[in-house]
Every structure is written in C-alpha cells, then in structure tokens.
C-alpha cells in the first residue's frame, strides 16, 4: 500500500510523494513516477516564502506613500516587501498597512520611549521631583531645580507640570 504520509518538504498525491516547490517558486505540475514536481520561479513583483504547492505566487506588498508608508526592505522572490512609516509616523498594526502621527506626551508626562516607525511614543507620568510643562514627542520629565545649590529657597513648590520657583533667603537676625 502507498504511504499515508510523506516526508518534510513533500506532499502526497496520486500515491506519489512529490517534492514541494522551494521558496521563490510556484507549482506548475505535480510529480509522476518518472518526473519530479515541475516548479517555476516567481516573477519580479511576486514571492512565496515557504516550501509550497501553490499554483500562484503572492504579490509583493505595496508601500503606499498616500498612507505615509515607505519601503524598509525590498521584497525578493522568497520574501515580501517590508513597509515602514515616514518620519514622524508609526504603523497602526503589526502588518503596517497604514501610519498615524506619533503621539505627544502632555504636560505632566514625559517620554519614556521615543517612537519608531513601528511603535508609538510611550509616555510616563512625571514622578515627584520631576516635571514636564510641554506637549512633546521627545522631551523626558526634567528634575525640579535645586534651589539649595543656588543658595536660594523654594518660594513656590513644583508640580508634575511646573518647576519649583526659587527666591532669595530671608536675611532676618535672631
């Protein structure tokens, strides 16, 4: 009886274990007892990234500039094109089908991680002793000014959105 399963990189058809086509090639005809599987290379704008029995290659992804996309890595017969976003934008999903502007961190929040083409800005609340008074996609929380090092005293306490206000020390005699 014929085998019910074939080895890796093979498929069973008409009681024959036929070789799958290698990445970058598509199936033209199945094997026979006397001939191996017939495969043809994908055209320049197409790819197949696995050992396969596909009769059509997949079209390379189009990085649409109208959606803010640009080519990060050109596709080959074995790999799809990889898109990324233009400067100031990041992908809306893992497959990077469209882009949106990087988010800015509001006052009271600083940038924990600057955005990339594939990930948005990550913001964090400014902890005690730090502040951010701007809406920015780049600025981290900054430390409050140290009045003491300037021989000044705190006249107004700092918040997560404002720096401390320093002023001169009172020169009262005891």
């Amino acid at each position: 009886e014929p085998p019910t399963a074939c080895r890796e990189k093979q498929y069973l058809i008409n009681s024959q274990c036929c070789s799958l086509c290698q990445p970058g090639q598509k199936l033209v005809s199945d094997c026979t007892e006397f001939t191996e599987t017939e495969c043809l290379p994908c055209s320049e704008s197409e790819f197949l990234d696995t050992w396969n029995r596909e009769t059509r290659c997949h079209q390379h992804k189009y990085c649409d500039p109208n959606l803010g996309l640009q080519v990060q890595q050109k596709g080959t017969s074995e790999t799809d094109t990889i898109c990324t976003c233009e400067e100031g934008l990041h992908c809306t999903s893992e497959s990077c089908e469209s882009c949106v502007p990087h988010r800015s961190c509001l006052p009271g929040f600083g940038v924990k991680q600057i955005a990339t083409g594939v990930s948005d800005t990550i913001c964090e609340p400014c902890p005690v002793g730090f502040f951010s008074n701007v809406s920015s996609a780049f600025e981290k929380c900054r430390p409050w000014t140290s009045c003491e090092t300037k021989d000044l005293v705190v006249q107004q306490a700092g918040t997560n959105k404002t720096d401390v206000v320093c002023g001169p020390q009172d020169r009262q005699r005891a």
């Epitope: 009886e1 014929p2 080895r7 290698q22 007892e33």
Partner: antibody, heavy 123, light 107 residues
Framework: EVQLVESGGGLVQPGRSLRLSCAAS????????MHWVRQAPGKGLEWVSG????????HYADSVKGRFTISRDNAKNSLYLQMNSLRAEDTAVYYC????????????????WGRGTLVTVSS | DIQMTQSPSSVSASVGDRVTITCRAS??????LAWYQQKPGKAPKLLIY???YLESGVPSRFSGSGSGTDFTLTISSLQPEDFATYYC?????????FGGGTKVEIK
C-alpha cells in the same frame, strides 16, 4: 550508526553472474527508496537501478536492462543486485545508495552511500 | 536522457581561494539538482540538494545556486579537506544523470 555496507563483488568472467548485497543499519530501511550507482575505474558516476520502499516501482538504466535485477528484503534491511550476462564494461565499483524519498525507483538523489564493492569482469 | 555538463573538468586552486563550478542541464530541471563531493577511494557525499539547500553537517562555505538549466557550486574559501572531485546530478526526471565531474586540485 547510520550506514550501508556492500558485499559480493569480485573477479568474474564475461557472461557469468554475480549477486551484490547491501546491508542497511541505523535508519528505518523500509521508509526509503534505494538505488545502485556504479563508477568505472577512473570514470564518473552512473545510476544503475532503483527500487521504491515497497518494491512496486523498479527501474533500470538502459545499459543493464534485461541483465540486472534489483530487489530488497525489508525484513532483513537488505538491498540486492543480481547481475547476469556480465560484460567487461560492467567493471566498476558498485555503490548502494539511499534516497530521501520513498515512492519511486525511477528518480531521486542520494543522501547516504555505502563504501562500494568492486566488480571486475575479465577473462 | 538529460545530459549534465560540468565545467571546468579540473581546477587548480590554493587554500583560501574562492572556487566556482558550473553545471548545465540539456533540459529545464526546475531546481532538482544535487551536488556531491568524492575523495579518492571513498564514496560520494551529498553536499547540496534542490540546487541551493545545504545538507545537514556540510560546512557553510559550500553554497549552490541556479534554476532551470544553469547551476553553480561555490566554495567560498577553499580548505585543505576540500580537494576532491565534485559531481552534479539531476533528479528531475528518469533516469537520474550525473555530470562528468570537476577535480579540484592543489595549485
């Protein structure tokens, strides 16, 4: 250890017969097609015959068709080549070779070879 | 039968050299081509199958390319143990056929 070991070669007169054997070990013999490939002294490689895992696909090179018979005994993990009506041009080292595929003896490539057995046909 | 033509028939090279061997099929064979290495008095050893796939345990300095009728075996940096004869073989159609071999010799 995965290996193939051929035996049965020797000096034989033209027109006589010889039977080669190949003992397989270290792999599931009845999962694979098997072949005989020969190499005349100082020459290149020539495929002689192939047999599928189940012996239902058996094929020969034109140069040996009608004179040589390939067979296998899966229970004994053994491959055989019965060579009749030997000619001087059959003089060669005969290699037993494993095919990574199973279902045809008509084509394939060879991922494991024995060390070979020399057959000399001379009067 | 499909004829396989290898060139050159021999090549002299030094350790560290890049060596390229070509194999041409008389008919289109997709990518169904294997390459073997044979040392004197030894059995052939499979290096590459499906034109470009390295057999397990074979050093990465060996690489294969090509599709259709024209194929190449490249040794990127020749090592002392690489001096041997190399054969291509088509397994696209019956019967399997080999190239005539290329002997890589020490210069």
């Amino acid at each position: 250890e995965v290996q193939l070991v051929e035996s049965g070669g020797g000096l034989v007169q033209p027109g006589r017969s010889l039977r080669l054997s190949c003992a397989a070990s270290g792999f599931t013999f009845d999962d694979y097609a098997m072949h005989w490939v020969r190499q005349a002294p100082g020459k290149g490689l020539e495929w002689v015959s192939g047999i599928s895992w189940s012996s239902d696909s058996i094929h020969y090179a034109d140069s040996v068709k009608g004179r040589f018979t390939i067979s296998r005994d899966n229970a004994k993990n053994s491959l055989y080549l019965q060579m009749n009506s030997l000619r001087a041009e059959d003089t060669a080292v005969y290699y037993c070779a494993k095919d990574p595929t199973a279902t045809t003896g008509a084509r394939g490539y060879f991922d494991l070879w024995g060390r070979g057995t020399l057959v000399t046909v001379s009067s | 039968d499909i004829q396989m033509t290898q060139s050159p028939s021999s090549v002299s090279a030094s350790v560290g050299d890049r060596v390229t061997i070509t194999c041409r099929a008389s008919k289109v064979i997709s990518s169904w081509l294997a390459w073997y290495q044979q040392k004197p008095g030894k059995a052939p050893k499979l290096l590459i199958y499906a034109a470009s796939y390295l057999e397990s345990g074979v050093p990465s300095r060996f690489s294969g390319s090509g599709s259709g009728t024209d194929f190449t075996l490249t040794i990127s940096s020749l090592q002392p143990e690489d001096f041997a004869t190399y054969y291509c073989q088509q397994h696209s159609s019956f019967p399997p056929t080999f190239g005539g071999g290329t002997k890589v010799e020490i210069k």
